[in-house]
């Protein structure tokens, strides 16, 4: 799941990883745009083993993966794309 959240909460990520995670092991990707209390964009990945990791938005692999998911958003996906508006 690729989700875009707009929130007034402060930053969620204390530290970020750039280590590649294959798509088959990912359950959900949450994108928190910068602003509203956090000065940077954050990407949170929920993995199939129930663990969660913050990923460096500059990591090449996550940028490539999000682009692939966006391109596929017109079809039914194992990793579907959702967007949430400002409440």
């Amino acid at each position: 799941v690729l989700e875009v959240y707009y929130t007034s909460l402060r930053c969620r990520c204390v530290q970020e990883s750039s280590v590649f995670i294959p798509r088959r092991f990912i359950d959900r990707i949450q994108i928190l745009p910068r602003g509203n209390g956090c000065p940077r964009k954050e990407i949170i990945v929920w993995k199939k083993n129930k663990s969660i990791v913050c990923v460096d938005p500059q990591a090449e692999w996550i940028q490539r993966m999000m682009e692939v998911l966006r391109k596929r958003s017109s079809s039914t996906l194992p990793v579907p794309v959702f967007k949430r508006k400002i409440p």
Epitope: P22, R23, R24, N49, S51, W61, M65, S75, L77, P78
Partner: antibody
């Protein structure tokens, strides 16, 4: 040349334990996710578990969760599978496989020859 | 969990025949599918990955196609060394193998 050599299989009673090893050579072991796949006699293939580069991330099929533990030692170029509380249905040839990866699609490109685990009383 | 249904489970054919094996996924897996060949007592050998990319060293008589939920492996002209068992594997969400297709000499 990529080589994966499994060892540690054998006959074990139900409820018993066994530790499988896989010695890797011919590639930079720490650059790859690794997996265990099994095949019951005369049956199909079944993914068992996977582990990330440094061993910090592990994934299991539901039927082995809590009983099996996948681990690795990058300094020794070795992959392990600790199997506890073994059941008759765990009887299979266990293969070690390298998970080649670029975008999450190119997977399990190299396999060992397998080691047979027989669970029987 | 994604289920893979492979058919047929067994197939008899002759040298020179064109053979097609099918795998159907229970949900969309895009093109994230691999085909393996396995001979008795041996480890599986990867033939095709990403649905249609031929593994280096694999003869061009092997080809793969499909997308979404339906995939096929085609052998255009069977050779004696092709008689084996073939498995598909989805790697879109964890891993699931098809049940296998045993290709036998008629």
């Amino acid at each position: 040349e990529v080589q994966l050599v499994e060892s540690g299989g054998g006959l074990v009673q139900p409820g018993g334990s066994l530790r499988l090893s896989c010695a890797a050579s011919g590639f930079t072991f720490s650059d790859y996710y690794m997996a265990w796949v099994r095949q019951a006699p005369g049956k199909g293939l079944e993914w068992v578990a996977s582990i990330n580069y440094d061993g910090g991330d592990t994934y299991y099929r539901d039927s082995v969760k809590g009983r099996f533990t996948i681990s690795r030692d990058n300094a020794k170029n070795s992959l392990y599978l600790q199997m506890n509380s073994l059941r008759a249905e765990d009887t299979a040839v266990y293969y070690c496989a390298r998970e080649e990866d670029y975008d999450g699609s190119y997977v399990m490109d190299a396999w060992g020859q397998g080691t047979l685990v027989t669970v029987s009383s | 969990d994604i289920q893979m249904t492979q058919s047929p489970s067994s197939l008899s054919a002759s040298v020179g025949d064109r053979v097609t094996i099918t795998c159907k996924a229970s949900q969309n897996i895009n093109k994230e599918l691999t085909w393996y060949q396995q001979k008795p007592g041996k480890a599986p050998k990867r033939l095709i990955y990403n649905t249609n990319i031929l593994q280096t060293g694999v003869p061009s008589r092997f080809s793969g196609s499909g997308s979404g939920t339906e995939f096929t492996l085609t052998i255009s002209s069977l050779q004696p060394e092709d008689f084996a068992t073939y498995f598909c594997l989805q790697q879109s969400s964890l891993y699931t193998f098809g049940q296998g297709t045993k290709l036998e000499i008629k």
